[in-house]
């Protein structure tokens, strides 16, 4: 029987993973800093564009892959080029928390794609 096509992560799964890695955490990835991004300019690709530069941090690899799968979709929310704030760097955990807050809002309002 033919194998299934790739199922994309759902917004709910992304939220669960973001909750999982931020729970009871004061820091992530040894306090690594990343560029702040405007999540309204396509949240998946915008967040990935910043987080792609983080290496040697197993805690966020699953999040990176989820974002990549969602960003890779055609058409997909967030396929638009993101706006990076090149003068503002924040800790990885802050970006992840910002993403969690934003994604939760999108999920509540049912605007998944």
């Amino acid at each position: 029987s033919p194998s299934p096509v790739t199922p994309s992560p759902t917004l709910k799964e992304l939220i669960e993973e973001l909750v999982n890695i931020t729970q009871n955490q004061a820091s992530l990835c040894n306090g690594s800093m990343v560029w702040s991004v405007n999540l309204t300019a396509g949240m998946y690709c915008a967040a990935l564009e910043s987080l792609i530069n983080v290496s040697d941090c197993s805690a966020i690899q699953r999040t990176q892959r989820m974002l990549k799968a969602l960003c890779s979709q055609k058409p997909a929310a967030g396929q638009i080029s993101s706006e990076r704030s090149r003068d503002t760097k924040i800790e990885v955990i802050q970006l992840v928390k910002n993403l969690l807050t934003y994604v939760r809002g999108v999920y509540r309002h049912g605007n998944f794609r």
Epitope: I52, S55, R62, R65, S72
Partner: antibody, heavy 119, light 107 residues
Amino acid sequence: EVQLVQSGAEVKKPGASVKVSCKTSGYTFIDYPMYWVRQAPGAGLEWMGYIDPYNGATSYNQNFKGRVTLTADKSTSTAYMELSSLRAGDIAVYYCATAVVATDVMENWGQGTLVTVSS
Amino acid sequence: DIVMTQTPLSLSVSPGETASISCKASQNLRNALAWFRQKPGQSPQALIYLVSNRYPGVPDRFSGSGSGTDFTLRISRVEAEDTGVYYCLQHWQYPLTFGAGTKVELK
């Protein structure tokens, strides 16, 4: 030391299926996904997909049109790649690999498994 | 899918010289570009990730540069052990895609 040991060479008939195994050691199996890449004789590298043993999540290269199935057995720290409806164009060395330092950059590779398709 | 165009397809270099391999992507990769080397009969070996970061054990003669869609791998002071086929890999989007490869040999 991370080690990936693959099963031996296979000879299959056209239309058949093949299942290649990749036994791991030296790291926590569920912490990192397992990637599969193939290389036809004298050709380049082609990414087939990955499986995350932690939750079974997969991503497949759609060029394989649903012929690839990736699975993982947490109890034995072994990953599997099954390719169905084999044809001559599937003759290749199949590699399993993991990415630890950078997401999706495969730095630890198995030795490869040659799959031959012949009637 | 993102298409990776690698040039040249083959390269003959004298020992001690510098070899340069180019990789062009069909769309912006941000920094998600890696380089591998494969020697005959062996599995690929990861050399560089995120454009310019060397893996442990990779000599500093190997350096990566570039941004956006254009990337370069430079091998300075080429040695006999540097021969093999070099591949670039984009890991910005799925499916991950490799360049066709550049065969590096010694003159």
